[in-house]
């Protein structure tokens, strides 16, 4: 059946609508569109003749209509007057007519609404407020939003006037929110700007902060008053009933016992005309002295000296407290407190014990802290490190060595070559070196305060020829699918290229192989048994090259699932049963057997002479690799037939 679908059905003014034709008959002569529910020549919009593939505008054509060859009609720039019915008249080749009618409705695009209010400053628990959504629009739906949420259910909220008016009875401060109204029709929805309801309230009973009521003589008294109020409250302070000042904060410096008494804060709201007061009682006590720390050793030596820190002055019936690095004391056998907690002893100090240390005296009101004390722990020197780490140099380059040792006070450095003192500096520089500069380079670090010295020796070889390199490994027996191995080519030499070979071939491309450290280090991730190969590293510079001896990687793996041979599972009574178990494993696994769950011997081969049907059952071989910590097993069923029968052998 011929039908017309309007897309969309509800159209906004200025937009477009498509009258879509469904089930258009075959073999047409042509078709025409008419405004209205019937065919009326005076209201023809458009005609289309199939034979000429040409359309003709009718009297009702406005220039905004476009007809498509599939008979659908597009109307653009829709106006209000376009609302209504449209009839398609189809003339078939047999001159039999068919008609279908469709319709759409036109709605205006809504303007942005606004909110008017009958009371801009309602008073809490007293006034009502009526919000009205403007303008009044026909065929529009009105919605309200509070803080971008739909209206809550409340007996104090009432909608009226077709939801255009929202009334809040007996407003509270919680009604201070963002209110929006929304107008909707089938083609548009618009929201107003927010209106913030300004509810006048308070003042509530004021709160005085801080809450503590006990103070020490000499402190500053700083009281702040706050009362919930809109508009903000005006504040007044009274001490023992006597007016002091009209401020939110009351400040009295350097108080004495005489400042003890009752302190009253009064809050006043000029718009509501209400007053509220709160009273707090302040007590001022005489002040104890500020503590300080004394030490029996201001420059203790690491791992040698103990230090006793004492909290002064000594006061009877007083609790002493200690802090290290702004934390309470950690539990440590090297920290000891005296019975009265006044003395803290550090046994065998380390460089990490520098502090800062604070002690405190607990009194009735608070804790008085000392100034922090920092220990000057003498330590070192540690073993010096010589950088850079190169040991091979080419003739003609400059040799620049730097020495560093952790030390307090900082170490003094000396350099020796082959035991002969050179200079007393942290850095050693020799320009344009030759083979004669090869030798033992010693850095000596000396701590003048502790009297300790430490040395480090480095062998420097100056040669145009590179040495034969060697490979060091961080893991001599890696486990398959678990470990990584890092090979490093030694020595580290300046201006040198590092190369690697596996089984005499250059490195294969693999995501499990990674070169780093200037190609000096070759890392194999997640090693497999196939990585058990010969690895060679090579070094080369512009004048020479050399290769290391091969290092074979010993990968621990397995045991894999064992195999029991022979594969036969059926035997004749009286035969010998000789089962051998094998599992791929490195190192070789330990073997054990179970028959029907009962442990047998710990051998690779299980031998039973002259078997009978009593030997029927499950034969399990267990393998265990102690190095990888992995186990595996396999079970085989054996059937023994009486010698009179002739069973078919099965694998």
């Amino acid at each position: 059946k011929l039908t017309i679908e309007s897309t969309p059905f509800n159209v906004a003014e200025g937009k477009e609508v498509l009258l879509l034709v469904h089930n258009l008959p075959q073999h047409l002569f042509g078709y025409s569109w008419y405004k209205g529910e019937r065919v009326d020549g005076n209201r023809q919009i458009i005609g289309y003749v199939i034979g000429t593939q040409q359309a003709t505008p009718g009297p009702a054509y406005s220039g905004r209509e476009i007809i498509y060859p599939n008979a659908s009609l597009l109307i653009q720039n829709i106006i209000q007057n376009d609302t209504g019915f449209y009839t398609l008249h189809v003339i078939k080749s047999d001159l039999v007519n068919e008609e279908a009618t469709g319709q759409f409705r036109v709605y205006p695009e809504l303007p942005k609404p606004s909110i008017s209010s009958n009371n801009s400053k309602p008073v809490e628990d007293k006034d009502a407020v009526a919000f009205t959504c403007e303008p009044e629009t026909q065929d529009a739906t009105y919605l309200w939003w509070v803080n971008n949420q739909s209206l809550p259910v409340s007996p104090r909220l009432q909608l009226s006037n077709g939801n255009r008016t929202l009334t809040l009875f007996n407003v509270t401060r919680n009604d201070t929110a963002s209110y929006k109204c929304e107008t909707q029709n089938p083609v548009s929805a618009r929201r107003s700007d927010s209106v913030i309801l300004n509810v006048l309230y308070g003042p509530d009973a004021p709160t005085i902060s801080p809450l503590n009521t006990s103070y020490r003589s000499g402190e500053n008294l700083n009281l702040s008053c706050h009362a919930a109020s809109n508009p903000p409250a005006q504040y007044s302070w009274f001490v023992n009933g006597t007016f002091q000042q009209s401020t939110q904060e009351l400040f009295i410096p350097n108080i004495t016992v005489n400042n003890s008494g009752s302190y009253t804060c009064q809050a006043h709201n000029s718009d509501t005309g209400l007053n509220r007061t709160t009273v707090t009682t302040i007590t001022v006590y005489a002040e104890p002295p500020k503590p300080f720390i004394t030490s029996n050793n201001s420059n203790p030596v690491e791992d040698e000296d103990a230090v006793a820190l004492t909290c002064e002055p000594e006061i009877q019936n007083t609790t002493y407290l200690w802090w290290v690095n702004n934390q309470s004391l950690p539990v440590s056998p090297r920290l000891q407190l005296s019975n009265d907690n006044r003395t803290l002893t550090l046994l065998s100090v380390t460089r990490n014990d520098v502090g800062p240390y604070e002690c405190g005296i607990q009194n009735k009101l608070s804790v008085d802290h000392s100034d922090p004390v920092i220990l000057n722990v003498l330590y070192g020197p540690d073993d010096p490190t010589i950088s850079p780490s190169y040991t091979y140099y080419r003739p003609g380059v400059n040799l620049s060595l730097s020495c560093h040792a952790a030390s307090n006070p900082p170490a003094q450095y000396s350099w020796l070559i082959d035991g002969n003192i050179q200079q007393h500096t942290q850095e050693l520089f020799i320009s344009n070196i030759t083979e004669k500069n090869s030798g033992l380079y010693t850095c000596q670090a000396n701590n003048s305060a502790s009297g300790h010295s430490r040395t480090t020796v480095k062998t420097i070889t100056v040669s145009a020829e590179l040495p034969k390199p060697s490979i060091s490994s961080n893991n001599s027996k890696p486990v398959e699918d678990k470990d990584a191995v890092a090979f490093t080519c030694e020595p580290e030499a300046q201006n040198t290229t590092y190369l690697w070979w596996v089984n005499g071939q250059s490195l294969p491309v693999s995501p499990r192989l990674q070169l780093s450290n200037g190609n000096r280090t070759l890392t194999l991730f997640n090693v497999t048994r196939n990585d058990a190969r010969a690895y060679v590293c090579g070094i080369q510079n512009s004048v020479s090259a050399n290769r290391s001896d091969p290092v074979t990687l010993d990968v621990l793996y397995g045991p894999d699932t064992p195999i029991i041979s022979p594969p036969d599972s059926s035997y004749l009574s009286g035969a010998n049963l000789n089962l051998s178990c094998h599992s791929a494993s490195n190192p070789s696994p330990q073997y054990s057997w179970r028959i029907n769950g009962i442990p047998q011997q710990h051998t690779q081969v299980l031998f039973i002479a002259k078997i009978t049907p009593n030997n029927n059952g499950t034969y399990a071989c267990f393998v265990s690799n102690l190095a990888t910590g992995r186990n595996n097993s396999i079970v085989k069923s054996i059937t023994v037939s009486a010698s009179g029968t002739s069973p078919g052998l099965s694998a």
Epitope: Y48, I50, G51, T52, Q53, Q54, A55, T56, P57, G58, P59, Y61, I66, I67, Y68, P69, N70
Partner: antibody
Framework: QVQLVQSGSELKKPGASVKVSCKAS????????MNWVRQAPGQGLQWMGW????????TYAQGFTGRFVFSLDTSVSTAYLQISSLKTEDTAVYYC???????????WGQGTLVTVSS | DIVMTQSPDSLAVSLGERATINCKPS????????????LAWYQQKPGQPPKLLIH???TRESGVPDRFSGSGSGTDFTLTISSLQAEDVAVYYC?????????FGQGTKLEIK
């Protein structure tokens, strides 16, 4: 966008045949009629006729019957003009032009020059 | 058949000046029932296909500069270029699509004086 692309220039001898193609893109070929227009060198536009792309029915203008054939291959969205027994006076630029739904011609192909010379 | 006659055959106008081309169908191309004139104007520049400028005798095609305008009804039509530009040099054709066979005018060549 809606576009008509015609085949390239042709040089033919008298008595030969030529087939000019017009490929439509950006719309469905069968929705709009296709006109053919001739323009002889230095001359005006001469309407040769049109083909109803929906039914395949051709209409030829006076003077363009017999040797001129309009055809379609809707599977490749292409209209064709075939001229047989070419004469030197058939030398011209041949245009295909889509018949707009109201009857005017828009757009036009870029034209195909057919030169008939012995 | 409707015969279309254009005048003049050629026209030379100074840049910025008005150019006027006339077109006379041998019979009316006004369809009374919708009051539409079935006449179009085309512009053809050298080496290019014709381009639709105006349809329904006076409706400018989108993208056509507003210095081009069409007027007239029945059997008398005019294409006007209000201020000639260098790029307007072309041959201009009128065409009726009122009845089959549709027909073109012989063309008017517009040049710059």
């Amino acid at each position: 966008q809606v576009q008509l692309v015609q085949s390239g220039s042709e040089l033919k001898k008298p008595g030969a045949s030529v087939k000019v193609s017009c490929k439509a893109s950006g719309y469905t070929l069968t929705d709009y009629g296709m006109n053919w227009v001739r323009q002889a060198p230095g001359q005006g536009l001469q309407w040769m006729g049109w083909i109803n792309t929906n039914t395949g029915n051709p209409t030829y203008a006076q003077g363009f019957t017999g040797r001129f054939v309009f055809s379609l291959d809707t599977s490749v969205s292409t209209a064709y003009l075939q001229i047989s027994s070419l004469k030197t006076e058939d030398t011209a630029v041949y245009y295909c032009a889509r018949k707009a739904i109201w009857g005017w011609f828009d757009p036009w192909g870029q034209g195909t020059l057919v030169t008939v010379s012995s | 058949d409707i015969v279309m006659t254009q005048s003049p055959d050629s026209l030379a106008v100074s840049l910025g000046e008005r150019a006027t081309i006339n077109c006379k169908p041998s019979q009316s191309v006004l369809y009374r029932s919708n009051n539409k004139n079935y006449l179009a104007w085309y512009q053809q520049k050298p080496g290019q296909p014709p381009k639709l400028l105006i349809h329904w005798a006076s409706t400018r095609e989108s993208g056509v500069p507003d210095r081009f305008s069409g007027s007239g009804s029945g059997t008398d039509f005019t294409l006007t270029i209000s201020s000639l530009q260098a790029e307007d040099v072309a041959v201009y054709y009128c065409q009726q699509y009122y009845s089959t066979p549709c027909s073109f005018g012989q063309g008017t060549k517009l040049e710059i004086k």
